[in-house]
């Protein structure tokens, strides 16, 4: 992965934090829940994009090259993004215009933008379906899918905002 | 792992009621959705009835729409099945069966050891 100009961190920080809340919003569960405590082996289910030790996110990875763990963060989003726009979400029970939801992906597509490089080219993946007989999993699905993207934004955030704190770039006073 | 028991099964005429029970124990905080399957002889297992566990929205298969309702109760950690208007069509080992989170697919992983239920004409 080359070097490359580095984001705005400080937008990135605050729209992963309003990410974060939104995911929230869209989906709360009752009761206890440990976002980050998931188990070694349910780590590569489906292919889900998880933000790991090799992916360069921790301090001294994002200080030597940060593109490692950005590359690995636009991953996530677009994986996300992806299933926000499949018939999971969009299929019955509909979601209402201005709902949690739809703020959500306006913000995902938001944070995607500011991290997609000019020249970056767009991965394809398949568009999830649900058959006739598999109709009645579609808020399950999107519960458990809104749960994992809470993990992955909980630990984004935390990229960002050591981002923001350590790697902005010092302004410049001008004579 | 999710532990499941089921209990309530027994024999009863056509038109009769009964109420199933799933006593759910262990990783209980990662339970996405608790479900009921059911197995007649000779047939594949089907889908009967789910129920979110953090939401509580439910999803019936269209044949015992209007005549089974699954309910819970979280501070049990238990769901159950009201079963109304029987048909002999209805006779099976029910199963209670959990999808926990991880991934981002329905996935009933752990299942009970079913409970008997037969109609008679």
């Known amino acids: 992965v080359p070097r490359s100009s580095s984001p705005d961190w400080a937008q990135c920080q605050q729209l992963s934090r309003n990410l974060c809340m939104l995911a929230w919003n869209a989906h709360a569960p009752a009761g206890h829940m440990n976002l980050l405590r998931e188990e070694e082996d349910e780590e590569t289910k489906n292919n889900v994009p998880r933000i790991q030790c090799e992916d360069g996110c921790d301090p001294q990875g994002l200080k030597d090259n940060s593109q490692f763990c950005l590359q690995r963060i636009r991953q996530g989003l677009a994986f996300y993004k992806h299933l926000l726009d499949s018939d999971i979400f969009k299929g019955e029970p509909a979601l209402l215009p201005d709902s949690p939801m739809e703020q959500l992906h306006t913000s995902l597509l938001g944070l995607s933008q500011l991290l997609q490089p000019e020249d970056h080219p767009r991965e394809t993946q398949q568009m999830p379906s649900l058959s006739s007989s598999q109709q009645w999993q579609r808020p399950l699905l999107r519960s458990k899918i809104l749960r994992s993207l809470q993990a992955f934004l909980a630990i984004a955030a935390r990229v960002f905002a050591h981002g923001a704190a350590t790697l902005t770039e010092p302004l410049v006073p001008t004579a | 792992e999710v532990q499941l028991v089921e209990s309530g099964g027994g024999l009863v005429q056509a038109g009769g009621s009964l109420r199933l029970s799933c006593a759910a124990s262990?990783?209980?905080?990662?339970?996405?959705?608790l479900g009921w399957f059911r197995q007649a002889p000779g047939k594949e297992r089907e889908f009967v009835a789910a129920v979110n566990w953090s939401g509580g929205n439910t999803y019936y298969a269209d044949s015992v729409k209007g005549r089974f309702t699954i309910s819970k109760d979280n501070a049990k950690n238990t769901v159950y099945l009201q079963m109304n208007s029987l048909k002999p069509d209805d006779t099976a080992v029910y199963y209670c069966?959990?999808?926990?989170?991880?991934?981002?697919?329905?996935?009933?992983?752990?299942w009970g050891q079913g409970t008997r239920v037969t109609v008679s004409s």
């Open positions: 069966a959990a999808d926990e989170y991880g991934g981002i697919s329905v996935d009933f992983g752990s």
């Open positions: 262990g990783r209980t905080f990662s339970i996405n959705a």
